[in-house]
């Protein structure tokens, strides 16, 4: 058993049929010594008496809010949550496996630049009685500070018969050095509580590996005289790290016909302009990637040829 926060405790249980469970000793936080009784949740049924109460925790029916009283007055509370371990593996019932980039990916994180700011998100099909708490650091043995905000519901989607809820959190490394080579990874830890079930999820990464620039901005077409060619121009996204001479991007320019089956023409360039042939009813799209490190491409920025 360990303390998650004040008056909230997590009991770790091996989960199998007829498991013995865990003996837990609850102590009433009071200078009183006599006349103390204990109840569970909203029930007025007395479990027992004494300043300490020993309970055998085996299942979710044994978890909940234990309260000690004296003469009708509440003295203190202890909320017990359960963390299940089945066949040596901690349960992952609360969050959905996103399966990207690999199986057992519950947390996904992205950064728009090298400032030390990043966003993580996760999915669940649970809509109520759900709380999340996020902590982060750089390194784990001698951790350096990363400050995370509160996790918020950022999207709701219908997937077949189920509703899926996306939660996200923004974090900022306290003393980030954008130009420095990373030697220690960022660690992100999410505590998830659904009713009386506790689970924790972790992710470890270097900022350089989760970089995904915003799409190029101000995408414009300039027709070239007496030609089907156009000059496409764009700018670095506002969110990208500066100076651009050091934090450089490379770009992919794509000409795509109306039909998905039509052949795509692609040009790769380090410049912020390119000359392409603009076919009727086609569109031109541009995306960006870090020039010196192959992390994710941005989403496409697009304009129609016409």
């Amino acid at each position: 058993i360990w303390e998650l926060k004040k008056d909230v405790y997590v009991v770790e249980l091996d989960w199998y049929p007829d498991a013995p469970g865990e003996m837990v000793v609850l102590t009433c936080d009071t200078p009183e010594e006599d006349g103390i009784t204990w109840t569970l949740d909203q029930s007025s049924e007395v479990l027992g008496s004494g300043k300490t109460l020993t309970i055998q925790v085996k299942e979710f029916g044994d978890a909940g809010q234990y309260t000690c009283h004296k003469g009708g007055e509440v003295l203190s509370h202890s909320l017990l949550l359960l963390h299940k371990k089945e066949d040596g593996i901690w349960s992952t019932d609360i969050l959905k496996d996103q399966k990207e980039p690999k199986n057992k990916t519950f947390l996904r994180c992205e950064a728009k630049n090298y400032s030390g700011r990043f966003t993580c998100w996760w999915l669940t099909t649970i809509s109520t009685d759900l709380t999340f708490s996020v902590k982060s650091s750089r390194g784990s043995s001698d951790p350096q500070g990363v400050t995370c905000g509160a996790a918020t519901l950022s999207a709701e989607r219908v997937r077949g018969d189920n509703k899926e809820y996306e939660y996200s959190v923004e974090c900022q490394e306290d003393s980030a050095c954008p130009a420095a080579e990373e030697s220690l990874p960022i660690e992100v830890m999410v505590d998830a509580v659904h009713k009386l079930k506790y689970e924790n999820y972790t992710s470890s990464f270097f900022i350089r590996d989760i970089i995904k620039p915003d799409p190029p901005k101000n995408l414009q077409l300039k027709p070239l005289k007496n030609s089907r060619q156009v000059e496409v121009s764009w700018e670095y996204p506002d969110t990208w790290s500066t100076p651009h001479s050091y934090f450089s991007l490379t770009f992919c320019v794509q000409v795509q016909g109306k039909s998905k089956r039509e052949k795509k023409d692609r040009v790769f360039t380090d410049k912020t302009s390119a000359t392409v042939i603009c076919r009727k009813n086609a569109s031109i799209s541009v995306r960006a990637q870090d020039r010196y490190y192959s992390s994710s491409w941005s989403e496409w920025a697009s304009v129609p040829c016409s």
């Epitope: 007395v46 027992g48 008496s49 055998q56 029916g61």
Partner: nanobody, 115 residues
Framework: EVQLVESGGGLVQPGGSLRLSCAAS????????MYWVRQAPGKGLEWVSS????????AYADFVKGRFTISRDNAKNTLYLEMSSLKVEDTALYYC????????RGKGTLVTVSS
């Protein structure tokens, strides 16, 4: 009429074990949290252990310290108390009760721990 009949008490040496039983009748046993309470010679009634209606939250007094195990069999309307590592100070009349104060209880079974 509510009836609670305890059995299984006796004389045992320190460190020994006993299993107490309590046969319940006259009420819907499976709907009630059940309790064991005890009264040592010349002392007041003392709560020992309790167990929820569906077997959840077995709870124990501090002095039990993992030595006693409470259980129930709702099909047989029977409550049990497995007692091990018995000490001289566990000597008492043990009652099965339907409330933690022992208002509704049986006649008791005597447990004597002595060398």
């Amino acid at each position: 009429e509510v009836q609670l009949v305890e059995s299984g008490g006796g004389l045992v040496q320190p460190g020994g074990s006993l299993r107490l039983s309590c046969a319940a009748s006259g009420f819907n046993f499976s709907n009630y949290r059940m309790y064991w309470v005890r009264q040592a010679p010349g002392k007041g009634l003392e709560w020992v252990s309790s167990i929820g209606a569906i077997g959840n939250v077995p709870a124990y007094a501090d002095f039990v310290k993992g030595r006693f195990t409470i259980s129930r069999d709702n099909a047989k309307n029977t409550l049990y108390l497995e007692m091990s590592s018995l000490k001289v100070e566990d000597t008492a009349l043990y009652y099965c009760a339907r409330d933690y104060q022992g208002v509704v209880r049986g006649k008791g079974t005597l447990v004597t721990v002595s060398s």
